[in-house]
Interface confidence: medium
């Protein structure tokens, strides 16, 4: 996260760190005790094998994420229409071998319901252990930052992403740059608060550099995928 | 909701398992038309920021809120399971319907042990004037939002 600040305990209790061989690779969001939402590009082959992955919940610092405190992944489900070139439908689910125990530091985020109206410049938050500057290293502590939703029409304008944004994507950040998600934040949450409830609006997907002017962050539009998510959960049950 | 990203025309609804399209009037009508039977298990949804429980009506080809009349938490648990939540039922309550709905789904309490949406029938009235708000999991609460001033 560029331009953010270190997170307080329990502020983003749905945030998980997803590790491969003891290294943070991507973020994710808890939606039930067993299911994590992340980005499909995080689990491209060969990382589509669940045994590669360990999830860490409720821990703010990477150096406290040792093997025994993690949760092994049992199943990885990538969206069937994910396109690795365009990053369209960039969403995936992970099912944990053992369910998480919820507490003050580990809680699920709400999936958005149909009929939820978002303002054109709705205030949202992003969080993750990604780089705090472009080409930087993974952060030791969880960081978070405020961003604004950017209308797809503006985001698709010639001076921004020139029609690369599909209905399965959502843009957030600031056109002047300075605040953004970055490498290592992928799969993590873009959330907003409505009715004193936090909703998962997006999963961190892609961008051109980090925090550059006219290059905001692009997120998977979770609203489009809620039905797909429920179908996977139901089929597994 | 279930129409999002469908390959079918506006009037058709896609089966996950086969990609074939079926008529909206065959969706949630009590008979499986999709090879995987998913046309009969995607019949409930939560709507809007107040988690209003809605059920799909094959007759009217649209979603309608469930009236609070005769509702009980057992039905809430069943609806949550229908959506894919396992063992995580949280709460259901009646809330005043401010959406201006004129068509509701009501429980037929004398119906046997059948899927929840099969116990529901159409009604243009809801005597409790409240619709079911259903939470399947205690989600979206962080330490900041749970510390409310007194």
């Amino acid at each position: 996260i560029v331009g953010g600040e270190s997170a307080l305990p329990g502020a983003w209790p749905w945030q998980v760190s997803l590790h491969v061989q003891n290294v943070h690779v991507c973020g994710g969001s808890i939606i039930t005790p067993e299911w994590i939402v992340t980005a499909a590009h995080c689990v491209e082959k060969p990382l589509n094998n669940p045994w590669h992955w360990t999830a860490f919940a409720g821990i703010l610092r990477q150096s406290f994420m040792f093997y025994g405190a993690g949760y092994q992944v049992e199943k990885v489900i990538s969206h069937p229409n994910y396109d690795s070139k365009t990053k369209n439908n960039d969403i995936a689910l992970m099912k944990l071998q053992k369910p998480l125990t919820f507490n003050d530091l580990v809680k699920p985020v709400c999936l958005p319901n149909p009929g939820m109206m978002l303002q054109p410049e709705q205030l949202c938050w992003i969080s993750g252990w990604g780089a705090t500057e472009e080409k930087g290293k993974t952060s030791e502590v969880l960081n978070a930052a405020k961003v604004l939703l950017i209308e797809t029409q503006r985001c698709n304008s010639r001076y921004v992403y020139d029609n690369l944004i599909t209905p399965a994507m959502i843009c957030a950040g600031f056109l002047q740059g300075n605040v953004d998600s970055c490498q290592g934040d992928s799969g993590g949450p873009l959330v907003t608060s409505k009715n004193n409830i936090w909703w998962l609006i997006g999963d961190t997907s892609w961008g051109s550099g980090c925090a550059k002017a006219y290059r905001p962050g692009v997120y998977g539009n979770v609203m489009v995928f809620t039905d797909w998510i429920y179908r996977q959960m139901r089929a597994d049950g | 909701w279930k129409f999002m990203g469908s390959k079918c025309s506006n009037s058709g609804i896609e089966c996950d398992s086969s990609g074939t399209c079926i008529n909206p009037s065959n969706w949630c009508d009590g008979v499986s038309h999709c090879p995987g039977g998913e046309d009969e298990n995607r019949c409930v949804r939560l709507y809007g920021p107040n988690f209003i429980l809605q059920v799909y009506s094959s007759q009217r080809k649209s979603w309608h809120p469930v009236c609070q009349d005769d509702w009980s938490e057992g039905y809430g648990r069943a609806a949550c399971q229908d959506m894919g939540y396992r063992n995580s039922f949280y709460s259901s309550q009646g809330i005043v319907d401010d959406s201006g709905s004129t068509s509701f789904m009501k429980l037929n309490t004398s119906a046997g042990n059948v899927d929840i949406y099969k116990k529901l029938y159409h009604s243009d009235a809801c005597s409790s004037k409240a619709v079911v708000s259903l939470r399947c999991i205690a989600c979206g609460v962080n330490l900041n939002s749970s510390r409310q001033s007194r």
Partner: antibody, heavy 121, light 111 residues
Framework: QVQLQQPGAELAKPGASVKLSCKAS????????MHWVKQRPGQGLEWIGL????????NYNEKFKSKATLTVDKSSRTAYMQLSSLTSEDSAVYYC??????????????WGTGTTVTVSS | DIVLTQSPASLAVSLGQRATISCRAS??????????MHWYQQKPGQPPKLLIY???NLESGVPVRFSGSGSGTDFTLNIHPVEEEDAATYYC?????????FGAGTKLELK
């Protein structure tokens, strides 16, 4: 109030094993990791290892990997440390201490009363 | 592992005077705006007691005569004015990473 209760003393023979307990009260047991610390008479503090009560999977100081085994019983809110193949070097006071891992700060804010282990034939 | 070196090993201070204890880490224990160094007091027959966390934050219930400072590799615990009940051994501890380690301790005596 928050307390970690440990038995006062344990006597064991060389080569034997001993299982120390640490009963927690006054807080949410699963929200804190439990650590164990050794202190030999007149010496400093030595970290043995930790156990997250949620997952039950422990992490050890290399020096104690073959000496200590940490477990928890969530239902009784008790953490245990088993010390095996005891020698006189294991005679020490053993403390359990809770650590608020979620705060990211990692300090020991509450300590157990300590158990004195004496290894003697 | 990060090694913490405390100095002096012991010191004798008169009532009302200042006691200064130093702790040096073999590598920086500061990151992301925090210094992960903490101080404990231990009296004979008792478990250690947390005094200062994150280099300079006073644990609740600890008298304000205790203060901590420092960042990176060099940290200091100050006690001023020293009172009779402060006679004890003081330990620094880092939590920059696992394993957490302790300094060897500084024994404070009253003259």
């Amino acid at each position: 109030q928050v307390q970690l209760q440990q038995p006062g003393a344990e006597l064991a023979k060389p080569g034997a094993s001993v299982k120390l307990s640490c009963k927690a009260s006054g807080y949410t047991f699963t929200s804190y990791w439990m650590h164990w610390v050794k202190q030999r008479p007149g010496q400093g503090l030595e970290w043995i290892g930790l156990i997250p009560p949620n997952s039950g999977s422990s992490n050890y100081n290399e020096k104690f990997k073959s000496k200590a085994t940490l477990t928890v019983d969530k239902s009784s809110r008790t953490a245990y440390m088993q010390l095996s193949s005891l020698t006189s070097e294991d005679s020490a006071v053993y403390y359990c201490a809770r650590w608020d891992y979620g705060s990211s700060y990692g300090y020991f804010d509450v300590w157990g009363t300590g158990t004195t282990v004496t290894v003697s034939s | 592992d990060i090694v913490l070196t405390q100095s002096p090993a012991s010191l004798a201070v008169s009532l009302g005077q200042r006691a200064t204890i130093s702790c040096r880490a073999s590598e920086s224990v500061s990151t992301s705006g925090y210094s992960y160094m903490h101080w404990y007091q231990q009296k004979p027959g008792q478990p250690p007691k947390l005094l200062i966390y994150l280099a300079s934050n006073l644990e609740s219930g600890v008298p304000v005569r205790f203060s901590g400072s420092g960042s990176g590799t060099d940290f200091t615990l100050n006690i001023h004015p020293v009172e009779e009940e402060d006679a004890a051994t003081y330990y620094c501890q880092h939590s920059r990473e696992l394993p957490p380690t302790f300094g060897a301790g500084t024994k404070l005596e009253l003259k």
